[in-house]
């Protein structure tokens, strides 16, 4: 697994460096998770041909993965800091059930999958400290999540592989949009 943010060789070599600001810490945390996703995607793409498959729509019907849209206030046009922050946190909370699903999907990168999951929880905490309007953040229903997890795990092998690929791709894209939006805040 990659070294967690704040523990890279640059930090060790530069003990007198200024401590990271809240924004820098969030930025670093997202990039750390993105590195983890890249490693997981590598294993997924090496193991199956899902990354080249054109049958993604079949699996996507079973999923309701968070996506960033114009109305969420995270793009340059119509940027709205508070609306966007709520969307990012809500989206990350919604991704948690999918990250739980990923936990038993990797052989050589099991540790990496756990690191992505745990780092996302930390990121949510960082962002919640930043948010002013916590009431607007809806937490997914645990019962709904549990039944979704059961449903996903009951899929055939091909659909499970495709689901894994789609989760990783969507999570990566969501984080990249979040990263860009947070840099405007």
């Amino acid at each position: 697994a990659p070294v967690p943010p704040g523990e890279d060789s640059k930090d060790v070599a530069a003990p007198h460096r200024q401590p990271l600001t809240s924004s820098e810490r969030i930025d670093k945390q997202i990039r750390y998770i993105l590195d983890g996703i890249s490693a997981l995607r590598k294993e997924t793409c090496n193991k199956s041909n899902m990354c080249e498959s054109s049958k993604e729509a079949l699996a996507e019907n079973n999923l309701n993965l968070p996506k960033m849209a114009e109305k969420d206030g995270c793009f340059q046009s119509g940027f709205n800091e508070e609306t966007c922050l709520v969307k990012i946190i809500t989206g990350l909370l919604e991704f948690e059930v999918y990250l739980e699903y990923l936990q038993n999907r990797f052989e050589s990168s099991e540790e990496q999958a756990r690191a992505v999951q745990m780092s996302t929880k930390v990121l949510i905490q960082f962002l919640q400290k930043k948010a002013k309007n916590l009431d607007a953040i809806t937490t997914p229903d645990p019962t709904t999540n549990a039944s979704l997890l059961t449903k996903l795990q009951a899929q055939n092998q091909w659909l499970q592989d495709m689901t894994t690929h789609l989760i990783l791709r969507s999570f990566k894209e969501f984080l990249q949009s979040s990263l860009r939006a947070l840099r405007q805040m």
Epitope: E24, D27, R31, E70, F75, E173, S177, R180
Partner: antibody, heavy 120, light 106 residues
Framework: EVQLVQSGGGLIQPGGSLRLSCAAS????????MIWVRQAPGKGLEWVSD????????YYADSVKGRFTMSRDISKNTVYLQMNSLRAEDTGVYYC?????????????WGRGTLVTVSS | DIVMTQSPSTLSASVGDRVTITCRAS??????LAWYQQKPGRAPKVLIY???TLESGVPSRFSGSGSGTDFTLTISSLQPEDFATYYC????????FGQGTKLEIK
């Protein structure tokens, strides 16, 4: 071979419109970040806009915001720069390029550039 | 927009000299900075990215350093083919460039 083929430049009157095209080959624009950069005659490089492949999210430099629109046609593997309300200061060579990496760290592929001249 | 300020705008030097060009960002950009070389009539070519990573195929006499707001490009021993214009570019948000440094023969 990875390359960007540009077209659409030319002479245009102030206040006019022009659309630049940039056709990509050797890679897909749907999974890459694209960027337009311009260079006025004898001057430096100026970032104009970029398009993050995810959701087609576009960003613009203050100097062109509201006048220029960057878009893409995934089926044609082409990006566009629609330029409206053109001014004399928009004159220059326009480069279409590709950001490298998932986190764009630098430009790794450049088009050959197309000249836009705004003059009456 | 993030404003990138490059200095000097012109630099006169001789073959074998060590030269340094600096670039300052109007806000912190972590290490998201690249350096390009441009020759007349040509598209720019990347030398350094992520502040200090040397692009493949670029001679080791080029090096970059810095993070946050202050960055430098160093050419340890100038070669005749190095006389060109150099630009810094940030990729933290958008992709604004410095105004360029023209490196000319003394």
């Amino acid at each position: 071979e990875v390359q960007l083929v540009q077209s659409g430049g030319g002479l245009i009157q102030p206040g006019g419109s022009l659309r630049l095209s940039c056709a990509a080959s050797g890679f897909t624009i749907s999974s890459n970040y694209m960027i337009w950069v311009r260079q006025a005659p004898g001057k430096g490089l100026e970032w104009v806009s970029d398009l993050y492949y995810y959701a087609g999210d576009t960003y613009y430099a203050d100097s062109v915001k509201g006048r220029f629109t960057m878009s893409r046609d995934i089926s044609k593997n082409t990006v566009y720069l629609q330029m409206n309300s053109l001014r004399a200061e928009d004159t220059g060579v326009y480069y279409c390029a590709r950001w490298a990496d998932d986190h764009p760290s630098h430009i790794d592929v450049w088009g050959r550039g197309t000249l836009v001249t705004v003059s009456s | 927009d993030i404003v990138m300020t490059q200095s000097p705008s012109t630099l006169s030097a001789s073959v074998g000299d060590r030269v340094t060009i600096t670039c300052r960002a109007s806000q912190g950009i972590s290490s998201w900075l690249a350096w390009y070389q441009q020759k007349p009539g040509r598209a720019p070519k990347v030398l350094i990215y992520k502040a200090s990573t040397l692009e493949s195929g670029v001679p080791s006499r080029f090096s970059g350093s810095g993070s946050g707001t202050d960055f430098t490009l160093t050419i340890s021993s100038l070669q005749p083919e190095d006389f060109a214009t150099y630009y810094c570019q940030q990729s933290w948000l958008g992709g604004s460039f410095g105004q360029g440094t023209k490196l000319e023969i003394k």
